[in-house]
């Protein structure tokens, strides 16, 4: 085609195009102040405005902050690019129990199959380990390498209380046990594995920084660029990302060039009062008994674990809504129904059981 073999550097004398020797073709010259979206733009739509660092240009042409993967339980899956947010996922050995835009709000450890059970499906970043009864003749303790990892005394084998089949009654009770040490506690103190990918220090494919002399005449090396810690929102406005600096908050998704940072309550807490991209008030989360086991669920991003033991054992424990997701900090419909005084009593030893309503919200059960 003629465009593939232009006259030397002239592009047939068309001033709106230039010849790129690297790709050996004529490219559209973005107007001054705009930034090319590809190496050799072909049309005006291939030009954009420039956002601030850690911001991306969203579908509405607004600079929005990229999410960050700075939480210890997250790793960067894809970097912050000029037109897409950074994407985070749970680090190896953990799965996402509560998803979030471009990230995961809550990661939990993969379950360790207990004695008598073997791994049916290994855990992924999205799904928990699925266990099944061991076949006769197979050593129940070491039916698979993962089963040989025995949890330390006093801990629960699951990463979190696991979902149950939809309850037939409006509420099921669960005793609150004081001697239980939550795996969430341990998770919150863990540091990222040395060989795990990390967003720290790794430049994205396009952080929004331009070459030495941005926007020279005719180069079009520009796009709307918001300041760092700001994102280009849906209306095209540079908007400040929320801060997760409060002690009871952790970063759920980072500040990206086209999406705000989002915060959630730290492990062991649940959002009682939601706020945009954050939580205004976090309260302690109900604790489940160490012996609790549940039935498998065949849904993505759910805590799908092993089958329950025979009848007559501990009652099911399910502090999450029936869909299996933990309450999201930004969802006003999934807040605790206990008052602040009652919420303070939940994590400590008590004889008062906590009931779960049909919506999965914990309420005090007078007994």
């Amino acid at each position: 085609f003629p465009q593939d073999r232009p006259f030397e550097d002239t592009c047939h004398g068309n001033p709106s195009h230039y010849y790129d020797k690297a790709v050996r073709r004529c490219c559209y010259r973005c107007p001054m102040g705009l930034f090319p979206t590809q190496q050799c733009p072909q049309r005006p739509t291939d030009c954009r405005k420039q956002c601030e660092p850690d911001y991306y240009l969203d579908e509405a042409d607004r600079c929005t902050a990229c999410v960050t993967c700075s939480r210890d339980d997250l790793v960067e899956k894809t970097p912050c690019a000029w037109n897409s947010s950074r994407v985070c996922e749970c680090r190896p050995g953990m799965f996402c129990s509560t998803s979030a835009v471009n990230s995961c709000a809550r990661c939990f450890f993969h379950s360790v199959c207990p004695a008598g059970m073997i791994v049916k499906f290994p855990g992924t970043a999205q799904k928990n380990t699925v266990c099944e009864p061991a076949s006769p003749g197979v050593s129940p303790a070491c039916a698979s390498p993962e089963n040989c990892k025995e949890p330390s005394s006093g801990t629960i084998p699951q990463a979190k209380p696991t979902p149950v089949s939809p309850a037939t009654s409006s509420a099921s009770t669960m005793p609150v046990r004081g001697g239980t040490r939550l795996a969430q506690e341990a998770a919150s103190k863990l540091t990222r594995a040395p060989d795990s990918p990390s967003s720290v220090g790794r430049p994205s494919s396009d952080p929004g920084l331009s070459p030495t002399q941005p926007c020279p005449e005719g180069s079009g090396d520009c796009r709307k660029q918001c300041e760092p810690d700001y994102y280009l929102d849906e209306a095209g406005r540079c908007t400040a990302c929320v801060s997760c600096s409060r002690d009871d908050l952790v970063e759920k998704t980072p500040c990206a060039w086209n999406s705000s940072r989002t915060c959630e309550c730290r492990p062991g807490m649940i959002c009682a009062t939601s706020a945009t991209n954050s939580c205004a008030r976090c309260v302690p989360y109900p604790i489940c008994a160490a012996e609790t086991v549940t039935k498998p669920q065949d849904m993505a991003e759910k805590d799908t674990t092993f089958e329950a033991p025979p009848l007559g054992t501990q009652p099911d424990c399910n502090p999450t809504p029936e869909n299996g997701e933990a309450p999201a900090s930004t969802s006003p419909t999934q807040s605790l129904l206990v008052d602040s005084q009652a919420s303070k009593t939940l994590p400590i030893p008590t004889s008062a059981p906590v009931a779960l309503s049909s919506t999965g919200k914990p309420v005090l059960d007078a007994g």
């Epitope: 850690d54 941005p214 926007c215 520009c222 300041e227």
Partner: antibody, heavy 119, light 111 residues
């Protein structure tokens, strides 16, 4: 040639407002953030905020939020900074400056507009 | 906001001497492998003039005797051999966080 030409000096009473203009030429006005910086007599520089003329997007220094309003007129390639509820400590030279896309530096500056607030 | 502290406040030197100006930030200015630190020169009655961007890149048209260095929180501007026209005020500026802030300035005066 890139040029930023600001309006002339102003003398204002406390409590009143002032609107300083900055006419740009020689570049694509809509595609560069326009910053506003002020400098009190014998003092340092203070960033007030910036506006993206292409769509009117703004960032403000919280210190001035509510008192400063940045606007831009694409048809005349002119940026405006209005400061209200003036007090004596607002006496300063006000600069407009174009922000480079990419490294956030301000490469071209207006000559400055002296605003004196006195009763 | 990020606080920038410049030192010394005044530097008294003679033409031909080497000048080293310091600027310390209250938190890191690192951003995707670059530091969002800028240096400006200002003479009486004039607007500031961009010298250095991204901590160490010299703006087009600025003499090679000007150089910038540093990363994280500690930065410096060096004038290898002072010329008479270099005696002026110098300001550092950060663009890492909004609001952008400037240092208090260093006055380079003739000794």
């Amino acid at each position: 040639e890139v040029q930023l030409v600001q309006s002339g000096a102003e003398v204002k009473k406390p409590g009143s407002s002032v609107k300083v203009s900055c006419k740009a030429s020689g570049y694509a006005f809509s595609s560069y953030w326009m910053n506003w910086v002020r400098q009190a007599p014998g003092q340092g520089l203070e960033w007030m905020g910036q506006i993206y003329p292409g769509d009117g997007d703004t960032n403000y220094n919280g210190k001035f939020q509510g008192r400063v309003t940045l606007t831009a007129d694409k048809s005349t390639s002119t940026a405006y900074m209005e400061l209200s509820s003036l007090r004596s400590e607002d006496t300063a030279v006000y600069f407009c400056a174009r922000r480079i896309n990419g490294n956030f530096a301000m490469d071209y500056w207006g000559q400055g507009t002296l605003v004196t607030v006195s009763s | 906001e990020i606080v920038l502290t410049q030192s010394p406040a005044t530097l008294s030197l003679s033409p031909g001497e080497r000048a080293t100006l310091s600027c310390r930030a209250s938190e890191s200015l690192e951003y995707y492998g670059t530091s969002l630190m800028l240096w400006y020169q200002q003479k009486p009655g004039q607007p500031p003039k961009l010298l250095i961007y991204s901590a160490s890149n010299v703006e087009s048209g600025i003499p090679a005797r000007f150089s910038g260095s540093g990363s994280g929180t500690d930065f410096s501007l060096t004038i290898s051999s002072l010329e008479p026209e270099d005696f002026a005020m110098y300001f550092c500026q950060q663009r890492r966080k909004v609001p952008s802030t400037f240092g208090g300035g260093t006055k380079v005066e003739i000794k």
